[in-house]
């Protein structure tokens, strides 16, 4: 008799793939333009990335540092109207993209929570949650919560409102903190909160350190669902050396939890790489005409158009990973086990019941390395085979689908491998 299938865990929509942050509508859409109506025209692109949710905004009226002139129920006319927003919601729904609204109150000011009149601010947030839930949004994001006093109690209250409306709604909180204790204390009072932080960016970017960061985080947060990013709002390129971008994309998509990206991460967009761009919101490079101020400043391989046509590009890798992440059970909700491998490497397995299993091997080092996989510290349920098929490599030159002998596995500098192998009873 075949062994009994393991019962599937309850899966919320944000468990099924990546979230994509558009913090600056105008920068995302390109120079001089950018509103909700225009964003609707970019939904096909987001669909092609297979992201499950769009974290949008803030979009509300906010007069810098003025609580009274901040209206979380009103869309700033520069971004469009409530009708434009409703249309965007409808179109996104048709494409199975959920919309999460950023309600960080004082986004134009220096202190995102005003650092004053917290009773008024909290009441405004509470009213806004109720209003926008009725309007049909799928969740909310609030950032910089380490600067909101009594953040835990407010988050608990806001989560109650969000989940009280529907368990299918999500609350995301962002913090600049990279301190695990602080992060855990924020998570403790909120069972379903998704927290983005700078935790992973406080790294020496070695295999050993990254492994230790990931395992400490997972141990500290127990069996709760995590999110993975390098910051609450910034681009990957702001935190990572360029040679590790592909490696981190592979890692973020294959760790147990929800990967969270900012617009441009998929093409390696750099903050302020081009003259006159604000550091926090560089213009998205759709094609070579995206930066008309300086002819020739943008080359094709920096753009969405150029990278879409190149199967070896970062964008193509992102799409491949996003596709795998959203359809493979082991990557969707599989168990996670790290195991010993060569110095400079971080290796782990994702497996779920009798489904195909995935092996991830990441070489953070500047030199080619023998993988030296040692499965002795793996549980019996997650043993390694002698061979596994290559799903993808972060570097060119390997043939996808080819079987690789794990004992003889060698990795190029900064190479990451995603391998698959079948369950064997």
């Amino acid at each position: 008799r075949a062994p009994r299938c393991r019962e599937l865990p309850a899966q919320k929509w944000w468990h099924t793939g990546a979230l994509y942050r558009i913090g600056d509508l105008q920068a995302f859409q390109g120079h001089g333009s950018g509103n909700l109506a225009g964003l609707k025209g970019r939904l096909d692109y987001l669909s092609s990335l297979k992201v499950k949710g769009l974290v949008l905004g803030p979009l509300h009226k906010n007069q810098k540092d003025d609580v009274a002139q901040t209206d979380l129920l009103q869309i700033d006319p520069n971004f469009g109207s409530k009708e434009d927003f409703d249309n965007l919601l409808q179109s996104a729904k048709k494409k199975s993209i959920r919309v999460i609204l950023d309600l960080t109150p004082n986004y134009r000011g220096e202190n995102l929570w005003f650092s004053t009149q917290v009773d008024s601010v909290a009441t405004k947030v509470k009213d806004a949650l109720e209003f926008w839930l009725q309007a049909g949004v799928d969740g909310f994001q609030v950032r910089d919560i380490e600067n909101l006093k009594d953040a835990s109690s407010f988050l608990a209250e806001w989560e109650n409102i969000t989940k009280g409306f529907s368990e299918d709604r999500l609350l995301i909180a962002g913090t600049n903190s990279s301190d695990l204790q602080q992060i855990v204390s924020l998570l403790e009072s909120n069972k379903d909160l998704l927290l983005t932080s700078s935790y992973l960016s406080d790294s020496s970017f070695t295999g050993e350190h990254t492994k230790s960061l990931v395992t400490q985080y997972l141990n500290a947060t127990g069996n709760r669902w995590c999110s993975w990013s390098l910051s609450q709002a910034g681009l990957l390129t702001s935190f990572l050396p360029a040679q590790l971008l592909r490696l981190y994309q592979l890692m973020l998509f294959t760790l147990p939890g929800t990967p969270v990206f900012s617009y441009g991460d998929e093409i390696g967009l750099k903050a302020a790489a081009l003259p006159g761009q604000p550091v926090e919101a560089p213009v998205m490079l759709w094609d070579e005409s995206s930066f008309p101020d300086i002819p020739g400043a943008v080359s094709a391989n920096m753009t969405v158009k150029g990278q879409s046509e190149d199967p070896g590009s970062l964008l193509s890798l992102f799409r491949q990973l996003s596709d795998q992440r959203s359809k493979e059970r082991s990557l969707l909700h599989g168990d996670f086990h790290t195991f010993s491998s060569g110095p400079g490497l971080f290796s782990y397995i994702r497996h779920w019941d009798q489904n195909e299993r995935f092996l991830v091997v990441l070489n953070f080092g500047d030199v080619g390395l023998s993988a030296g996989l040692q499965a002795s510290d793996l549980p019996a349920s997650a043993s390694l085979p002698t061979k596994a098929d290559l799903v993808l490599s972060t570097q060119p030159g390997r043939e996808e689908g080819s079987p690789l002998e794990l004992e003889r596995l060698k990795l190029e500098p900064h190479e990451g491998l995603l391998l698959r192998f079948p369950y064997v009873a």
């Epitope: 540092d65 004053t116 009773d119 006093k149 209250e157």
Partner: antibody, heavy 117, light 107 residues
Amino acid sequence: EVKLEESGGGLVQPGGSMILSCVASGFTFSNSWMNWVRQSPEKGLEWVAEIRLRSNNYATHYAESVKGRFTISRDDSKSTVYLQMNNLRAEDTGIYYCSRGDPGAYWGQGTLVTVSA
Amino acid sequence: DIQMTQSSSYLSVSLGNRVTITCKASDHIKNWLAWFQQKPGNAPRLLISGATILETGVPSRFSGSGSGKDYTLSITSLQTEDVATYYCQQYWSTPYTFGGGTKLEIK
């Protein structure tokens, strides 16, 4: 116009009790955190207690020096905040102000509490 | 508890001169700092909250600055009506605490 008016102060013996009231008008009382702050020549301005909103389960916080002796409460239907003071001591003497918000954007004129034998 | 220290208890400044009053917190208070002005016989009046945000109706000669543990109240050109005692208060964590006050008089 925002108005806060304290009452209930006076002379009381050590060990005695007293209740202060503060009636508010000119703003949405039920949406505002309320505080009691006292002032004496010896200690200067000293925050005493805070009460939050119904949605915060009327959470209260107290200065260490009054914990277990003073109780802050509110009646949103009457736009009134109270401070019940028990087991009063000489060092509790001072002017007691109620203030609205966080920090106190509006203050009453204060009521004098004198604890003396 | 977070202690708030105002280094000067008294300041004597000539009319029209710039005044700087400092306040130091014993721990980080993330800009959750207020400045109050109190004149004899009156309740304190909020001038600045969030370390830098000027309350409505407060003259623009008043300004606040600082972050972390160190904060400053400045008056660009001292006027007669500015004679008062100035207090800082942290309201980042309970118990909220006030500084000891700085009494400002005209030289």
